[in-house]
């Protein structure tokens, strides 16, 4: 039910990448405002984004407290200028979000190749270990810190002049691959969480090629 001049939020959607997590919803408010609450299954509700006219709320600070918990959010609708007003049942109109478990559902952000170094016929490719907003002991954890061996990277590499392409995989952030001497190669990486069935892979990193600034070549 609710008051006649407010409508319930709908299409509540979690948007999350590398644990940066925002709840979005509709509709754009007309003469109403929203407040969001979030809780774990067993926890108390905590209010965020008080009386906002936005249709999104950044809940990162709450979910990073324990990324393996399952969270539920709800969006309350209030008449603009009369936020004390409640519905006919004695409480404001609200809508529940789907459940959200950050560890299982956050999207993997596009990775970046930090560097590559050639020594003879070997190339060491290093993937940047991106910092997340997850904290432990007052320090921000990297993606590898959070996921550990649950996260792998797939490297694709190919000769600049060729239609062939090879792959290697690692559960660290480094690859050591064999290359042909005197050939220039290009590289791209993708993050994967093999244990997942959805949101399993990132987009491919930007392509980096030998002969560009990120690389280093040493003749042995």
């Amino acid at each position: 039910s609710g008051t006649t001049n407010t409508v319930a939020a709908y299409n509540l959607t979690w948007k999350s990448t590398n644990f940066k997590t925002i709840l979005e919803w509709e509709p754009k408010p007309v003469n109403q405002v929203y407040t969001v609450q979030i809780s774990t299954k067993s926890g108390d509700w905590k209010s965020k984004c008080f009386y906002t006219t936005d249709t999104e709320c950044d809940l990162t600070d709450e979910i990073v407290k324990d990324v393996k918990q399952t969270y539920l959010a709800r969006v309350f609708s209030y008449p603009a200028g009369n936020v004390e007003s409640t519905g006919s049942a004695g409480e404001p109109l609200y809508e529940n979000s789907p459940e959200f478990t950050p560890y299982l559902e956050t999207n993997l952000g596009q990775p970046t190749i930090q560097s590559f170094e050639q020594v003879g016929t070997k190339v060491n490719v290093t993937v940047e270990d991106e910092r997340t907003l997850v904290r432990r002991n007052n320090t921000f954890l990297s993606l590898r810190d959070v996921f550990g061996k649950d996260l792998i990277y797939t490297l694709y590499y190919w000769k600049s002049s060729s239609s062939g392409k090879k792959t290697a995989k690692t559960n660290t952030n480094e690859f050591l691959i064999d290359v042909d001497k005197g050939e220039n190669y290009c590289f791209s990486v993708q993050a994967v969480i093999p244990s997942r069935t959805v949101n399993r892979k990132s987009t491919d990193s930007p392509v980096e090629c030998m002969g560009q600034e990120k690389g280093e070549f040493r003749e042995i």
Partner: antibody, heavy 116, light 106 residues
């Protein structure tokens, strides 16, 4: 649902070229890599090659001079071409979808016999 | 190229037995190892990927372990439908399978 189906000749003569087609449904060839694998009667699986999502390819070291993998994304088809066929190439040929850390869907396989 | 060596090539076991199959890679494969089950006249079926991740729908009696170069597939209590050939596979190009382990009825 996800499906792969191999088609092509059941019998080829020695020195001829084999062309097999893998027709896929339920997924896009621009989102998943597709591999070819073969298995001679009573023997182990042997990886032949792959076509990546961008159309680039990679092949078995021992067979790369004889293999070509191509695709037609509009028809959802991947094509394996193998030249200079020999009786030792008699096998069941499979295509399979790559799931990054394993092949999660396979075709039913097609038996190719090489004989004069 | 990375080669895969499976052992044993065959084994005989009874329903209810615990069965262990091993696979060794010629170099470190960073746990990128899959196990397949194949029955006569059928395509292989993915059981386990990334060393120990059970593929959806696969019974929990199947488990995988290992790291570096040495890996194991374990069937905790063999069932009648488990008599088949099992293959390991690594996913660095060029990809490679083990030579297979046939699990037969004792």
């Amino acid at each position: 649902q996800v499906q792969l189906k191999e088609s092509g000749p059941a019998l080829v003569k020695p020195t001829q070229t084999l062309t097999l087609t893998c027709t896929v449904s339920g997924f896009s060839l621009t989102n998943y890599n597709v591999h070819w694998i073969r298995q001679p009667p009573g023997k182990a699986l042997e990886w032949l090659g792959v076509i990546w999502t961008d159309g680039k390819t990679d092949y078995s070291t021992s067979l790369k001079t004889r293999l070509t993998i191509s695709r037609d994304t509009s028809k959802n088809q991947v094509v394996l071409t193998m030249t200079n066929m020999d009786p030792v190439d008699t096998a069941t040929y499979y295509c399979a979808r790559d799931w990054d850390t394993g092949f999660d869907y396979w075709g039913q396989g097609t038996l190719v016999t090489v004989s004069s | 190229d990375i080669q895969m060596t499976q052992s044993p090539s065959s084994l005989s076991a009874s329903v209810g037995d615990r069965v262990t199959i091993t696979c060794r890679a010629s170099q470190n494969i960073n746990n990128i190892l899959a196990w397949y089950q194949q029955k006569p006249g059928k395509a292989p079926k993915l059981l386990i990927h990334y060393t120990s991740s059970l593929q959806s729908g696969v019974p929990s009696r199947f488990s995988g372990s290992g790291s570096g170069t040495d890996f194991t597939l374990t069937i905790s209590s063999l069932q009648p439908e488990d008599f088949a050939t099992y293959y390991c596979q690594q996913a660095y190009t060029p990809y490679a399978f083990g030579q297979g382990t046939k699990v037969e009825i004792k």
